[in-house]
């Protein structure tokens, strides 16, 4: 039995780890699933952040795992992306759905960050250069669209390179190769890692390597 307190919990199940799998919500002591109608990266971002897996990698329209069972608790989930919990997003009401089946259970793949790396290259030292991120074993770049000093601040702090001195686009530090992992990132400058900034999804972009972004951090400028 339970006395008071919130009666909702969230988990991902049947995935490779706690940060991937079918989305399940516990409401009134019962675990149930979420229907994928209107499923979006904003919802995935909320889930990943809520579970302490702050990188939203992808949002399968349905669970890329076995279908769930029990109640379908949520449908038409609509998030802004800044909600602190999935149940703060709009939906059709608890247990209300439009004839969903468990074949439409929503799934999520987040990352715990442990398989991610970042470096700056072609800048003459470790604290300046083109931004490169290793994701799923492949090094890739970041597009300069809407890139600004807030993004640079996150990168410099993450790499323990001090503060951001400047940022550049148009492949100022040369064109990279491989995937372009990020485009149109939205950072407030306080994120602990670049991949914790809001984004459209890994590898989603409309760029080419002529738009690769770079930064110069204060510790890099000192070495120049």
């Amino acid at each position: 039995s339970s006395l008071g307190g919130t009666d909702k919990e969230l988990r991902l199940v049947d995935g490779e780890n706690k940060c991937s799998g079918r989305v399940e919500v516990k409401v009134q002591e019962e675990w149930g699933t979420v229907c994928n109608n209107g499923w979006s990266m904003e919802a995935v971002s909320v889930i990943c952040n809520q579970l302490g897996c702050p990188t939203a990698i992808k949002a399968p329209g349905w669970a890329n795992s076995s279908a769930g069972s029990g109640r379908i608790w949520m449908d038409h989930v609509s998030c802004r992306g800044n909600e602190s919990a999935l149940w703060d997003c709009k939906h059709d009401g608890w247990g209300k759905h439009s004839n969903c089946t468990h074949q439409q259970d929503a799934g999520v793949t987040c990352s715990d960050g442990s398989n991610l790396e970042m470096r700056l290259t072609r800048g003459g030292n470790m604290c300046s250069g083109r931004i490169e991120i290793k994701f799923q074993g492949r090094w890739g770049t970041v597009c300069d669209d809407n890139f600004n000093i807030d993004h640079a601040s996150v990168i410099c702090r993450q790499l323990e390179c001090g503060s951001a001195v400047s940022f550049s686009g148009s492949s100022n530090f040369g064109e990279g190769s491989g995937p372009i992992w990020f485009d149109d990132l939205i950072c407030n400058g306080n994120e602990s890692a670049l991949w914790n900034c809001k984004h459209q999804g890994w590898g989603k972009h409309n760029c080419d390597h002529a738009e690769d972004a770079g930064v110069i951090c204060s510790k890099g400028a000192d070495l120049s």
């Epitope: 008071g4 009666d7 002591e29 059709d92 608890w94």
Partner: antibody, heavy 116, light 107 residues
Framework: QVQLQESGPGLVKPSETLSLTCTVS?????????WNWIRQFPGKKLEWMGS???????YYNPSLKSRVTISVDTSKNQFSLKLSSVTAADTATYYC?????????WGQGTTLTVSS | DIVMTQSPSSLSASVGDRVTITCRAS??????VAWFQQKPGKSPKPLIY???SLQSGVPSRFSGSGSGTDFTLTISSLQAEDFAVYFC?????????FGGGTKLEIK
């Protein structure tokens, strides 16, 4: 359609234990839903007392501390409320209420007076 | 516990009027607010769930809106059978709590 019917003593003496029963018709109590008790004081204020889910798990309002117990009798398709150590402040109309999550179905209520 | 503060506590209106009742939560309850109508000697009747969704069989003149802490029940054109007491309640977290009620009377 779920139908709920409360039954109880009407009058209870202070310090005694109140026992109320809700008989459910049109639906099996073990199939689904949360089964709640809600009371309404003479001034019209509503208070949720607690729930028992079809799975058997219970939730109680902390304001009632350990005075409240909700249980199910599946053989009779009933659920019950026990409230111990009653006082005049427990005088109210008691409703049994159910729904998947929301308070969708209400009984007509039973009025309880606590008086010596 | 989340406190639901309803206003006004009583309201006089005429048939055909547009009436608005408000409910404020002491902390955010997302959209998890329900509205109930109660007539003398009867149990509360659910009108709205999840802030704005109409319960089955409830006339479309009733509508709900709001999210976070501020919520509204609106009756677009009062009918004689709408004079009653109205309650809001939050479904966001345990313990579920209710507003103190608004008595809607005939002017």
């Amino acid at each position: 359609q779920v139908q709920l019917q409360e039954s109880g003593p009407g009058l209870v003496k202070p310090s005694e234990t109140l026992s109320l029963t809700c008989t459910v018709s049109g639906y099996s109590i073990t199939s689904d839903y949360a089964w709640n008790w809600i009371r309404q004081f003479p001034g019209k204020k509503l208070e949720w007392m607690g729930s028992i889910y079809y799975s058997g798990s219970t939730y109680y309002n902390p304001s009632l501390k350990s005075r409240v117990t909700i249980s199910v009798d599946t053989s009779k398709n009933q659920f019950s409320l026990k409230l111990s150590s009653v006082t005049a402040a427990d005088t109210a109309t008691y409703y049994c209420v159910s729904g998947t999550y929301y308070f969708d179905y209400w009984g007509q209520g039973t009025t309880l007076t606590v008086s010596s | 516990d989340i406190v639901m503060t309803q206003s006004p506590s009583s309201l006089s209106a005429s048939v055909g009027d547009r009436v608005t009742i408000t409910c404020r939560a002491s902390q955010s309850v997302s959209s998890d607010v329900a509205w109930f109508q109660q007539k003398p000697g009867k149990s509360p009747k659910p009108l709205i769930y999840y802030a704005s969704s109409l319960q089955s069989g409830v006339p479309s003149r009733f509508s709900g809106s709001g999210s976070g802490t501020d919520f509204t029940l609106t009756i677009s054109s009062l009918q004689a059978e709408d004079f009653a007491v109205y309650f809001c309640g939050q479904d966001y977290t345990s313990p579920r709590t209710f507003g103190g009620g608004t008595k809607l009377e005939i002017k």
